[in-house]
């Protein structure tokens, strides 16, 4: 598979790796989200491991307010991180593809 | 880097690999989008290479109607593909993580 197709596959499989641990197997509860972030996105989390930060993040992702993060909410989250990465990328011309 | 962080990096770098070819270097025009889809997402495209299908897809992605696809619109598109993959994943219990 092409790298982008592999990337999409990783997004899906990573979600289910953690959503499958407790409760609704198609949703991430707070502890599952915490584990996913800690293990799979350590660069995003950094040192922010305090409870209030997790609660805020969970609340911001949980658009339907069911105390869980479903796959659509997770995709929105990953898109936000990708957009932050993209802003960083666009801010460093030497890291960018050739000028048009 | 962890697989999910690599996946996000691939999302960003793939966009710029094609957006950097002509016109606005931070947006995909129609020909750049066509090339990205053909080369990076062949499974998604399948046999749908006719012009009308591309025009329709371009129109659907271009939410701000500027005839180009910016990074945010591209993320929405990838999220939609990921959600389709996820529906397929959830539809096959033997492929799922262990039951809770």
């Amino acid at each position: 598979a092409c790298p982008l197709e592999k990337a999409l596959d990783v997004m899906v499989s990573t979600f289910h790796k953690y959503s499958g641990k407790e409760g609704d197997k198609f949703k991430l509860n707070k502890s599952e989200l915490k584990e996913l972030l800690t293990r799979e996105l350590p660069s995003f989390l950094g040192k922010r491991t305090d409870e209030a930060a997790f609660q805020k993040l969970m609340s911001n992702l949980d658009s339907n307010r069911d105390n869980e993060v479903d796959f659509q909410e997770y995709c929105v989250f990953l898109s936000c991180i990708a957009m932050m990465c993209n802003e960083f990328f666009e801010g460093f011309p030497d890291k960018q593809p050739r000028k048009k | 880097a962890c697989p999910l962080e690599k996946a996000l990096d691939v999302m960003v770098s793939t966009f710029h690999k094609y957006s950097g070819k002509e016109g606005d270097k931070f947006k995909l025009n129609k020909s750049e989008l066509k090339e990205l889809l053909t080369r990076e997402l062949p499974s998604f495209l399948g046999k749908r290479t006719d012009e009308a299908a591309f025009q329709k897809l371009m129109s659907n992605l271009d939410s701000n109607r500027d005839n180009e696809v910016d990074f945010q619109e591209y993320c929405v598109f990838l999220s939609c593909i990921a959600m389709m993959c996820n529906e397929f994943f959830e539809g096959f219990p033997d492929k799922q993580p262990r039951k809770k």
């Epitope: 409760g23 209030a52 609660q55 969970m58 609340s59 911001n60 658009s63 307010r65 069911d66 | -």
Partner: antibody, heavy 120, light 107 residues
Framework: QVQLQESGPGLVKPSQTLSLTCTVS?????????WNWIRQHPGSKLEWIGH???????NYNPSLKNRLSMSRDTSKNQFSLKLSSVTAADTAVYYC?????????????WGQGTLVTVSS | DIQMTQSPSSLSASVGDRVTITCRAS??????LNWYQQKPGKALKLLLY???RLHSGVPSRFSGSGSGTDYTLTISSLQPEDFATYYC?????????FGGGTKVEIK
């Protein structure tokens, strides 16, 4: 200390639109919270109306959805409610509340409430 | 919608009494249960959230327990300022719903 203050007309004629505004002070009107409207009918029954929160995300009570509109003005630290085609059944004390980000999203701060009477 | 049923609807008690109020949900609400106090003519005040967690500034005589569909608010030793109406509310899913209230009166 967070304070919420409801404002708007206390009397609305049937079939008209009820409009209320809540002003938040003592706290920045941040994305970390959802801002709610709740009403208490004369018999003390409490009814959640809806809320607005992260990224402008809005959720309405399905029983009121077709008559409801909510918005916010972050520059003024305000959020507002519009309920159209009101009847006597909409007579209630209307509260604006802040929804915490903690488990179960409790309503941790409340306005003092404003009585809205629907009558001709 | 999830229905919340409180009992009793009212009770009479004396200062120093132990008071228990129950709340039943029409389906499992996974401990996402909050309790509020309201005095006449005033807004509600949050007491407990997520079944048993005390909101800041709330006296420790208030406690909560339960799981699944059945939950309890307990006041270990009733004080004069505790005479009020108490409401439960589920935070499990939308739309948010409240119990009908329990009025605690002086015996």
């Amino acid at each position: 200390q967070v304070q919420l203050q409801e404002s708007g007309p206390g009397l609305v004629k049937p079939s008209q639109t009820l409009s209320l505004t809540c002003t938040v002070s003592g706290d920045s009107f941040t994305n970390d919270y959802y801002w709610n409207w709740i009403r208490q009918h004369p018999g003390s029954k409490l009814e959640w109306i809806g809320h607005i929160g992260y990224g402008g995300n809005i959720n309405y009570n399905p029983s009121l959805k077709n008559r409801l509109s909510m918005s916010r003005d972050t520059s003024k630290n305000q959020f507002s409610l519009k309920l159209s085609s009101v009847t006597a059944a909409d007579t209630a004390v209307y509260y604006c509340t802040r929804e915490s980000f903690y488990d179960g999203y409790p309503f941790d701060y409340w306005g003092q409430g404003t009585l809205v009477t629907v009558s001709s | 919608d999830i229905q919340m049923t409180q009992s009793p609807s009212s009770l009479s008690a004396s200062v120093g009494d132990r008071v228990t109020i129950t709340c039943r949900a029409s389906q499992d609400i996974r401990n996402y249960l909050n309790w509020y106090q309201q005095k006449p003519g005033k807004a509600l005040k949050l007491l407990l959230y997520y079944t048993s967690r005390l909101h800041s500034g709330v006296p420790s005589r208030f406690s909560g327990s339960g799981s699944g569909t059945d939950y309890t608010l307990t006041i270990s030793s009733l004080q004069p300022e505790d005479f009020a109406t108490y409401y439960c509310q589920q935070g499990n899913s939308l739309p948010r719903t409240f119990g009908g209230g329990t009025k605690v009166e002086i015996k």
